[in-house]
């Protein structure tokens, strides 16, 4: 499934814009803010009432090659006694990010941007109850 | 850059790392085909650590619009629907990659940018510091 094209002309095209072949765009993969650090509260994945584990997926043909995915540890949530309460639900929270994929076709190489959905963590929710007539 | 396995039959001139600048097809592929139907957009209200969503728009960025979470309470919602301050609502943050127009306003020239977004909130047991 494809989404609409990125990068059609808008404003007045400045003269300083680099020339780009039709049907493609120039992408500098030197990341802005590469060294910023996440200042998330300490080990919230273990302290949460909807705890989660992390898995690192690694793909040498993807940039960045490492993408970290979270998985909820339980179906229910952890109560004050440290027991799983199945009257509540642990659910994944997801966020979209972009990656660059390198594709080999014979000896030629092409690059494709992809939207990827990352599971970031989990939250505890009250379930939706469906009443059957 | 990162190391890329090469077809051994190909000429050796190709750099095995990702180059600094690449030409990318204008179509962005959506790997999230048939996104999880269980994925709900009302978790922000049903969570024991509910959050509000704030709209952030920047036309020089792709995606231009990002909705960011801000926890509604310091504490968490208990079974009675009240805020329990013995627990804490904390944001779940994630670094994501977006595209930044560079130079600005250029239609087909971008640079990857890492930004930190708050995606939602989760309820945690607080860290208690005992003062001697």
């Amino acid at each position: 499934r494809k989404i609409p094209k990125v990068g059609h002309t808008f404003f007045q095209k400045p003269e300083s814009c680099p020339p780009v072949p039709g049907g493609s765009m120039k992408l500098d993969i030197g990341i802005i803010n590469e060294n910023q650090r996440v200042s998330m509260s300490r080990n919230i994945e273990s302290r949460s009432t909807s705890p989660w584990n992390y898995t690192v997926t690694w793909d040498p043909n993807r940039y960045p090659s490492e993408v970290v995915q979270a998985q909820c540890r339980n179906l229910g949530c952890i109560n004050a006694q440290g027991k799983e309460d199945i009257s509540m639900n642990s659910v994944p929270i997801q966020q979209e990010t972009l990656v660059v994929r390198r594709k080999h076709q014979g000896c030629s190489v092409s690059f494709q941007l992809e939207k990827v959905l990352v599971t970031v963590g989990c939250t505890c929710v009250t379930p939706v109850i469906h009443h059957v007539q | 850059g990162i190391t890329i396995p090469r077809n051994p039959g190909c000429p050796n001139s190709e750099d095995k790392n990702f180059p600094r600048t690449v030409m990318v097809n204008l179509n962005i592929h959506n790997r999230n085909t048939n996104t999880n139907p269980k994925r709900s957009s009302d978790y922000y209200n049903r969570s024991t650590s509910p959050w509000n969503l704030h709209r952030n728009e920047d036309p020089e960025r792709y995606p231009s619009v990002i909705w960011e979470a801000k926890c509604r309470h310091l504490g968490c919602i208990n079974a009675d629907g009240n805020v329990d301050y013995h627990m804490n609502s904390v944001p779940i943050q994630q670094e994501i990659l977006v595209l930044r127009r560079e130079p600005p306003h250029c239609p087909n020239s971008f640079r990857l940018e890492k930004i930190l977004v708050s995606v939602g909130c989760t309820c945690v047991t607080p860290i208690v510091h005992h003062v001697a």
Epitope: V6 | S41, Y44, S64, W67
Partner: antibody
Framework: EVQLVQSGAEVKKPGSSVKVSCKAS????????IHWVRQAPGQGLEWIGV????????FYNQKFDGRATLTADKSTSTAYMELSSLRSEDTAVYYC??????????????WGQGTTVTVSS | EIVLTQSPDFQSVTPKEKVTITCSAS?????IYWFQQKPDQSPKRWIY???ELASGVPSRFSGSGSGTDYTLTINSLEAEDAATYYC?????????FGQGTKLEIK
């Protein structure tokens, strides 16, 4: 073909509520926000607010905050606008329009056909 | 709230004439959008991001401007251009529209 099909005309009493639907087809519903705009008889256009079907996020023109509620159902690709505590000044044509989240300079590109809401005692 | 003031409110024009509609913003905005609306129809996106013509819009239309002053120009008016044109800003909340300019063909 992109289409935004809105529900039919409504006649309401002052103080009551109205809920207008907007069914989207021909595109990926969650790639676009849904904005709502109204037009009183013989008047100009007035922005009510926005709903993001993907995240569930909403943002309102302060004038309508507390009275308007924007929601969406991803399973049916339908957006809704509910307006409560209706008064005669709310008599207008209500439009839904889509807005691409990824490249916002396109603006509001497709519009629904409009729903006439008449508030009269 | 950014107020958009269009000028003129109403204009009666002869075919083939050049028409200029201006939109003045009470504060600086990054770009403007123009919509065309005909009686009993929904608005149509006409010009986006100040300069870009929406698909299907004849090339006799053009958009320009920056800061607080923006213009929609029709180089050689045709009968089908009779409509009300609205400018729109989304640089600041709440998003606002101009009061509209009604073009009538003489």
């Amino acid at each position: 073909e992109v289409q935004l099909v809105q529900s039919g005309a409504e006649v309401k009493k002052p103080g009551s509520s109205v809920k207008v639907s907007c069914k989207a087809s021909g595109y990926t519903f969650t790639d676009y926000e849904i904005h709502w705009v109204r037009q009183a008889p013989g008047q100009g256009l007035e922005w009510i607010g926005v709903n993001d079907p993907e995240s569930g996020g909403t943002f309102y023109n302060q004038k309508f905050d507390g009275r308007a509620t924007l929601t969406a159902d991803k399973s049916t690709s339908t957006a809704y606008m509910e307006l409560s505590s209706l008064r005669s000044e709310d008599t207008a044509v209500y439009y839904c329009t889509r807005y691409y989240r990824y490249e916002s300079f396109y603006g509001m590109d497709y519009w629904g056909q409009g729903t006439t809401v008449t508030v009269s005692s | 709230e950014i107020v958009l003031t269009q000028s003129p409110d109403f204009q009666s024009v002869t075919p083939k004439e050049k028409v200029t509609i201006t939109c003045s913003a009470s504060s600086s905005i990054s770009y403007i959008y123009w919509f065309q609306q005909k009686p009993d129809q929904s608005p149509k996106r006409w010009i986006y991001a100040t300069f870009e013509l929406a698909s299907g819009v004849p090339s006799r239309f053009s958009g320009s401007g920056s800061g607080t002053d923006y213009t929609l120009t029709i180089n050689s008016l045709e009968a089908e251009d009779a409509a009300t044109y609205y400018c729109h800003q989304r640089s600041s909340y709440p998003w606002t529209f101009g009061q509209g300019t009604k073009l009538e063909i003489k």
